[in-house]
């Protein structure tokens, strides 16, 4: 079954630093994001080969990309408090996989003593749970049906 | 530029079934909600059912809950509608509509399709 392998598990940086995110699958995808998760998921970038990436606004000018979306290396820079998260690889397959995730932790330089991170990866609790195999449940629901456009907004 | 194209629409007899399409082309796919609206003559347009960006939740309208079911490809950016147990009632033109939610890199962006009629009759 498709995978994604997404490392390093925890990164501890202190604010204004750059960190790597990388994320690599067997291939055979259509293109892939990086997701912030939380009670919104949030897209970061989606990385498409041969397609110019799109950046969430509160990250252009701050995100680097290396390598092609089989095996993708994200580096964000310049790291803000505000930045500190937990961030995982999806790749766009037949079936929906994600990577185990990443949890970024950014801190005051003088307090990065208090705030480490462990060697097992980030706390279940802040991914969606997984079913049985790599495949996940989409974390980012629709409970409700839109609400129709307007009027005006018809062709 | 951004197209929404329907297709599989015609004419079918109370009980038959049709399978809609929609291709995608000019956006990122995967970054949408998608949802398939209908309009009867003299009716207004209204909304069939509609499929997460990822696949992982459906709604439907409660008169074709248990008879259509909405799926999508995001490899081939494409969005379906199966229609079983058509009754008269079902005849419309079938739109397609994408919708970027909260959380997307396009949040708010949202595309409509041209069309395709759907006629149950006997």
């Known amino acids: 079954a498709q995978e994604v392998q997404q490392s390093p598990h925890c990164t501890t940086v202190p604010v204004g630093a750059s960190v790597n995110i990388t994320c690599s699958t067997s291939g055979g995808l259509r293109g892939i994001y990086l997701r912030q998760l939380g009670p919104q998921p949030q897209d970061i970038i989606y990385y498409e080969d041969g397609v110019v990436p799109t950046t969430d606004r509160r990250f252009r000018g701050r995100i680097d990309f290396s390598g092609s979306q089989d095996n993708l290396t994200i580096t964000m820079h310049r790291l803000q408090l505000s930045d500190t998260g937990t961030y995982t690889c999806q790749a766009i397959t037949e079936v929906n996989v994600y990577g185990s995730g990443t949890l970024v932790l950014v801190t005051e330089e003088q307090s990065q003593g208090w705030h480490r991170c462990s060697d097992a990866p980030p706390r279940a609790s802040a991914l969606p749970a997984p079913p049985t195999g790599s495949a996940l449940p989409d974390p980012q629901t629709a409970s409700a049906l839109p609400d129709p456009p307007a009027a005006s907004a018809l062709p | 530029q951004v197209q929404l194209v329907e297709s599989g629409g015609g004419l079918v007899q109370p009980g038959g079934s049709l399978r809609l399409s929609c291709a995608a082309s000019g956006f990122t796919f995967s970054g949408f909600d998608m949802s398939w609206y209908r309009q009867a003559p003299g009716k207004e347009r209204e909304l069939v059912a509609t499929?997460?960006?990822?696949?992982?939740?459906?709604n439907y309208e409660d008169s074709v809950k248990g008879r259509f079911t909405i799926s999508r490809d995001n490899v081939k950016d494409t969005v379906y509608l199966q229609m079983n147990s058509l009754k008269p009632e079902d005849t419309a033109v079938y739109y397609c509509?994408?919708?970027?939610?909260?959380?997307?890199?396009?949040?708010?962006?949202?595309?409509w399709g041209q069309g395709t009629q759907v006629t149950v009759s006997s």
């Open positions: 509509y994408a919708l970027a939610p909260a959380g997307s890199l396009w949040h708010g962006d949202n595309y």
């Open positions: 499929i997460s960006r990822f696949g992982g939740s459906s």
